[in-house]
Every structure is written in C-alpha cells, then in structure tokens.
Amino acid sequence: LSLEAPTVGKGQAPGIEETDGELTAAPTPEQPERGVHFVTTAPTLKLLNHHPLLEEFLQEGLEKGDEELRPALPFQPDPPAPFTPSPLPRLANQDSRPVFTSPTPAMAAVPTQPQSKEGPWSPESESPMLRITAPLPPGPSMAVPTLGPGEIASTTPPSRAWTPTQEGPGDMGRPWVAEVVSQGAGIGIQGTITSSTASGDDEETTTTTTIITTTITTVQTPGPCSWNFSGPEGSLDSPTDLSSPTDVGLDCFFYISVYPGYGVEIKVQNISLREGETVTVEGLGGPDPLPLANQSFLLRGQVIRSPTHQAALRFQSLPPPAGPGTFHFHYQAYLLSCHFPRRPAYGDVTVTSLHPGGSARFHCATGYQLKGARHLTCLNATQPFWDSKEPVCIAACGGVIRNATTGRIVSPGFPGNYSNNLTCHWLLEAPEGQRLHLHFEKVSLAEDDDRLIIRNGDNVEAPPVYDSYEVEYLPIEGLLSSGKHFFVELSTDSSGAAAGMALRYEAFQQGHCYEPFVKYGNFSSSTPTYPVGTTVEFSCDPGYTLEQGSIIIECVDPHDPQWNETEPACRAV
C-alpha cells in the first residue's frame, strides 16, 4: 500500500496506509545493487581516524581483507599523481622573502615502472636515478655536479636526514626522491635528462643534452631545498648540511603525496626553531590550498591532518651564522572517510562504516516518511563521498497505526506550517484489550476554517472527544479513548496556515492508568505498569521548574482508573 498524495478539497479522505506499530513511508524500492565493484590494491593501514563506535566494523573489514570495505578506486592504481605546479600559492610571503615559484613539483622526470602485483606500494620498487653520460653545459650560476662520463648522479639529498623512511607497508609506487634542483638564478631541471656522446680520433666530440622541463625564475632563490615523498609514511627532517650561499637563509619545501582516498597525517616528533624561522603546513590536492598549521601551532606531539592526499611543508630559516633550527616530523597516510551522515530530524541513521564501501541506512520516526534514498554508500574518491544526498523525514498526511503502543502523530510539514487544502485521517489502534491516551504536545491552527477533530472510535462518524471548532482550550491532561481506537482528522482550507499539531499517544491496559509524561523533565513510579494505587513523582531538568498539576500523582478508581491530578509541566526558569 502506498500513501496517496493529500487530496485537494475537503471531505475527501486520502488513502490510508497500514503499518504495524509504526507509520513509515510507503516502501520505496531499494536502490538496485550498484554496479560499481569496489576494487583496490591499497594496503591495509592502521587507521587513525575511524569513529570509535565503528571500530568493530573497520577492524573486521580489514582483517577479512574484504574488498567491499577497502577504498574503491575509480581507476587502475598508478603511482600517486605527481604534483601539479601550484604549490602553496597562498602562503604568506614572510619576511619579504621571494614568493615561492618552485620548479620542483611536477615530477614527470621519473621513469614509470610497470606495477607489480603487490600494488602501488610495492616494497620492491627502486628509487629512480638520473643517469648522466656527459657533463651538462653549465648555465648561468648553476650548481651542477661535475661528473665524468658514465658516472651516476644520485638524486638522494646530501644528508641522510632528508631521506624518506620506508618503515610502513612498503613504498607507494616509488619514493619520488628529490630531483636535481637549482640554486642561484633559479634554473630548475626536471624531466628526463638524456645525453649522447660521439667520439673518434679525428672527430670533434659532440654532446647533446635534452632538458624536458626548464623553469626559470628571475628572483634570487635560497638554496636547493626541496623534496618529494610519496610512500605511505616517512620522516621529514630539517636540512643539516646543505651548502648554501652565506647571505641567504633556507627556503625548503617538503611535498607529500599519498594514494588518493588517503589523507596525510603529520606528527611533530621534535621541533626547535630559532627566532624568526617559520614552518607552515598546507593541504594540497583540493580546489584551493588548505592552511593547516604554522610554527606557533607545531608543538611536540602535535598531529596535523590534511583531509586531502597531498600536503606541503615549508621551512624558512635564517641565514648563517644564526640558523637553521631543527625539526623532526613523521608523516603517514590515513584512510579518508565520508563525513558522518546528518541524522534526519524525526528520524535516525545507522552507519556500518564511514570508509569507502560502508553504508548508512535511514529511517523515520512514527508519523514521518522518508524523502530521498533510504540507503547511502560511501564511494571512494580523493575525498570520499556518499552516493546520494542525506534524506529527510517528512510528516505524513494520515495513515493507520496498528498495535499503537507509543508514538506521535504530526501534521504534514511539522514543525513548519502545514499546506492548504489538506484532509488527513489517522487511525490509531491500541493492542487488544488496551486503550489509548492522547496528549497534545502542540496544536496551532490558522484562525479561519482549519480544523482538528479527534474521534472516539475508528471512523469519520464516531463522536468526537476533541473538535477545534467547538473547544476553546486544549485539555492539559490529554484524552482517553473508551475503546482501542482514536480517529484523528485534520482538514485545512485554501487560506492561512500554521504549525499544525503534534500529538503523542500511548496505549495502556484496562485497569491501569496511562504512562505519565513530562516534557523537559522526568518521573519515578512505584510500579512500572501503573495499576491502581501507583504513585508517580515528577522532577524537571536543570533550568526548568514544575508548574501546574502536582509533583506526586496517584492512579485511582478501580472501575475507571485515572490519575487523581493532572501531570505537571516543566517551564524554563
């Protein structure tokens, strides 16, 4: 059965939907099982950002190696995408040092190796090196290693303090180590450098050098101080034995790129900066750089998380003899997750996992129906996302509530205004042998011809116990049915609107009183089922005080059990 749309005009009853104890939406067909198959070759990481309540789901999924719970990849896993050259454009130009225009980030130079079956973090991958078979022609103020033919120029930084560690589950593709970088006039060489030499006794020696990418900056840049990291974890250490010009401080950049679907977590293990030195951390890979921290925030033990798969750290030091200061940071990749889905007003959400492949299921409170997807799946992406918008719970216009024990009936749109030209009918039916108590939480009708009728029976002709046309004041004690039914009727005309109504109901056994209720308060009872003789004592939440009614009420009259006093109300102090 499905709820029909509210009928236009008065006197027409809409379709009525039967439910068992709870009014819900007409069953929306479940979204078909998605065709997306979640596949990944990303390794299992110790996750640091999971919701504590979800621990059992995550751990279970990781132990199983369940592909459904691993991040979904919309592409074949290649090594982490190289940086596009837009690093840190928004960092403040501190101390009037040259604004960063680093030549280093786009690392097209590195040869691509076929993926091993271990995946993108295969521990077997090797550091790429640039093989130089002839001396490069020196450019203006270029610091170039002078090598003989056949020598290998390692791109590993001069001090082991800058080498990315590979302590984790292997390398993420390859440790994209720093390439040849420039100083002085700022000519950066990146790309594949190939040289060929032809020589003979009588021939002139010819050297051909191809430089694929050349970036030229016209400002005087600090020393060669830029590294790229792309393993799942590594160490970022301050440079210690860089030979740099005596009149310039360091301006160093550490670029971290982990697998899409992961974020970068940086932990400060040690930091000791000199006056005037700065360290700034930004998240990259999103639409805009995301400032994450600076030296004033970077204290020992501090953890900074980039919600994107790329991050950059910039260190600016003083010129000798004063500097530089030192630091030791450790970074690691952490699995990104979807945001916790918003709980719909008048509904709830159950989440299996916030990580890609996880799902969120929504349902609505009695009297509301779900508008939108009942089931969302977390999809993998650079920033994982839910595959649909969060649904909302909309108040239904009418319905049948069988086995009504406790719940609420609310008018369409509540707590917002109802619409015009509605005729909504609700039938409440208590379990066999029980009666109903109906309590008015709120009734707000437009002054014109909008009308709420509550009938003591199961049909539109049953005599009313409340009719807004005829009754000026709401009974604070609520209403009791003489049998097991209440029939609620809301009709609105073509003009004016108000918030409508919220009615709370509860069933109670014959020979018993109904369960008391106090908003913004609580009560204790001498007996849980409220037979004759039960006493109930009320109290209010902090900031509220008891008004009207009595603090203690008693269930009296064996022939027609009822509370001897009305329930009190708790009002804000």
């Epitope: 009308r451 003591n456 005599p463 009313p464 116990v465 409340y466 009719d467 046309y469 005829e470 009754v471 000026e472 004041y473 709401l474 009974p475 209403l479 003489s482």
Partner: nanobody, 124 residues
Framework: HVQLVESGGGLVQPGGSLRLSCAVS????????MAWFRQAPGKEREGVAV????????YYADSLKGRFTISHDNAKNSLYLQMNSLRAEDTATYYC?????????????????WGQGTMVTVSS
C-alpha cells in the same frame, strides 16, 4: 451567569411524540457543545444527542438513531429534541447541557452547565 431551563416534558403513550426545548441564557460563546442527556430511575445518566454550536455537527447515542432529532436555533439561543416513536424505556428525566471543553461528547465530561431537567413518562 449561565442558565438552562428545559420544558416540554410530560406523559405520553408508547408510539407517541414529544418535543423538548431548552432556553439557554448567559452562554455567549459561538462555539461549544449543546446536548441532551437522560437519567432513568436507578440508572446512570446517559448521552442522548449533541450538536456543535459552530460546526452544526450532530451525534446520537447508537440506540436512539432514527427516532430522536436534535436541533438548535442560534437566534433564540434554544436547543430542541424531537422524540418520535416513544417507548416505555424512554421514560427518564431529560437534561439540557452546554460546554466547550474536550471530552467524549456523549458523556458528561465536556459540559460545565446543566439544566434542572424535565420529566418524560411513556406509559399506556
């Protein structure tokens, strides 16, 4: 000060008819219920019929439908009960009541004001 005065009761033979009237004064609300109740000797008071002042909605006790008719005249502020095909079991004191509170309209709970009653006897 609200006052209700019933009239029209008396002795009638089975199968006969009677028309009861209730003059209401002091009740100025445009809304509320106006009802007829009856109480037979040795029995509890029971609702006979009710009419809404604003809505004009009418409700009867199940056992009486078809024989009794309730009506009211707003201009005269009067309530009427037309009783046809009277039976011996209709013998009772008939009361007029008005009220604007919530409650089962065919029970006494919504009614704040009551008349003194008029006696109807159905006997041959």
């Amino acid at each position: 000060h609200v006052q209700l005065v019933e009239s029209g009761g008396g002795l009638v033979q089975p199968g006969g008819s009677l028309r009861l009237s209730c003059a209401v004064s002091g009740f100025t609300s445009s809304r509320g219920w106006m009802a007829w109740f009856r109480q037979a000797p040795g029995k509890e008071r029971e609702g006979v019929a009710v009419i809404g002042r604003r809505s004009g909605d009418i409700y009867y006790a199940d056992s009486l439908k078809g024989r009794f008719t309730i009506s009211h005249d707003n201009a005269k502020n009067s309530l009427y009960l037309q009783m046809n095909s009277l039976r011996a079991e209709d013998t009772a004191t008939y009361y007029c009541a008005v009220g604007d509170q919530a409650g089962h309209v065919l029970t006494s709970s919504p009614y704040r004001y009551w008349g003194q009653g008029t006696m109807v006897t159905v006997s041959s």
